[in-house]
Interface confidence: medium
Amino acid sequence: LTCLGGFASPGPVPPSTALRELIEELVNITQNQKAPLCNGSMVWSINLTAGMYCAALESLINVSGCSAIEKTQRMLSGFCPHKVSAGQFSSLHVRDTKIEVAQFVKDLLLHLKKLFREGQFN
């Protein structure tokens, strides 16, 4: 989890801190959304279950040239134990359903808030 602290944390951070910072970043994205996020780019929907961090990263990594989600992509990579590259897909993707990045972020945020409340930090 070393990279999860962004610029504020030079070394490894506790999972609870990492998850909170990810949530704060997603909140920030939804708050500051003036124009359509990432120009309305569509991404594969995912099942919000075990392994969802890698699945979320696999979806979002296919969005290029969108600075608004770059920090989120970096943070998600800290939660995913393996390297993720564009075009990679797991069974957690709902392959027949694409949604806008903005909706994807809102859905992910809602789920992460629930996990945080329940103390599921890993």
């Epitope: 962004g6 909170r20 910072e21 704060e24 945080f116």
Partner: antibody, heavy 121, light 107 residues
């Protein structure tokens, strides 16, 4: 005991400045987002500003944007509100309030006792 | 901005009465809603968080329900110490907004 204690309130003339402080104790201050909330005499509650745990995310109510600045010093377990260009309508009791786990999650679980700010000539 | 409306604005009740206060949000806020009790000259005290979770130390006669846009605070059997003003708060998105409050006084 988990506690928040505000200070710095007082009487100030319109256009003047004031700096409020909120001292936190009994919990790991750096792990919590913080807010300022105010209440004008005889009125309801109004959220004023929010600051995240590591300073990166800050939000303000439109009514104070450009005039108030929220900040925190995690080393001193303290939250601040710098209030400039004060107006009569800023007269209120100012409370600091903790976010239970940050990032809008289960907000405002702990409140201070409040500090009164009066803006009058 | 999300607007919060509360009803009724005030009510008179007797000890032992069941009291219900409603809060409506102008758009969906999930369960990002809290209920607060405030007595004159005191800071607000949280009763309910996440729309329906009871704050530790708060008597079980208080309960919350709802999600999305409509929420309810219920006091199953009003006690003398419950006479106060009650506020709802949405913390789903900034600016956070409080309801205008419901004053509960003695009939």
């Amino acid at each position: 005991e988990v506690q928040l204690v505000e200070s710095g309130g007082g009487l100030v003339k319109p256009g003047g400045s004031l700096r409020l402080s909120c001292a936190a104790s009994g919990f790991t201050f750096s792990s919590y987002s913080m807010n300022w909330v105010r209440q004008a005499p005889g009125k309801g509650l109004e959220w004023v500003s929010y600051i995240s745990t590591s300073y990166n995310y800050i939000y303000y109510a439109d009514s104070v944007k450009g005039r108030f600045t929220i900040s925190r010093d995690n080393a001193k377990n303290s939250l601040y509100l710098q209030m400039n260009s004060l107006r009569a309508e800023d007269t209120a009791v100012y409370y600091c309030a903790r976010d239970q786990v940050g990032a809008t999650l289960d907000a405002f679980d702990i409140w201070g006792q409040g500090t009164m700010v009066t803006v009058s000539s | 901005d999300i607007q919060m409306t509360q009803s009724p604005s005030s009510l008179s009740a007797s000890v032992g009465d069941r009291v219900t206060i409603t809060c409506r949000a102008s758009q969906g806020i999930g369960d990002d809603l809290g209920w607060y009790q405030q007595k004159p000259g005191k800071a607000p005290k949280r009763l309910i968080y996440a729309a329906s979770s009871l704050q530790s130390g708060v008597p079980s006669r208080f309960s919350g329900s709802g999600s999305g846009t409509e929420f309810t605070l219920t006091i199953s059997s009003l006690q003398p110490e419950d006479f106060a003003t009650y506020y709802c708060l949405q913390h789903n998105s900034y600016p956070f907004t409080f309801g205008p409050g419901t004053r509960v006084d003695i009939k």
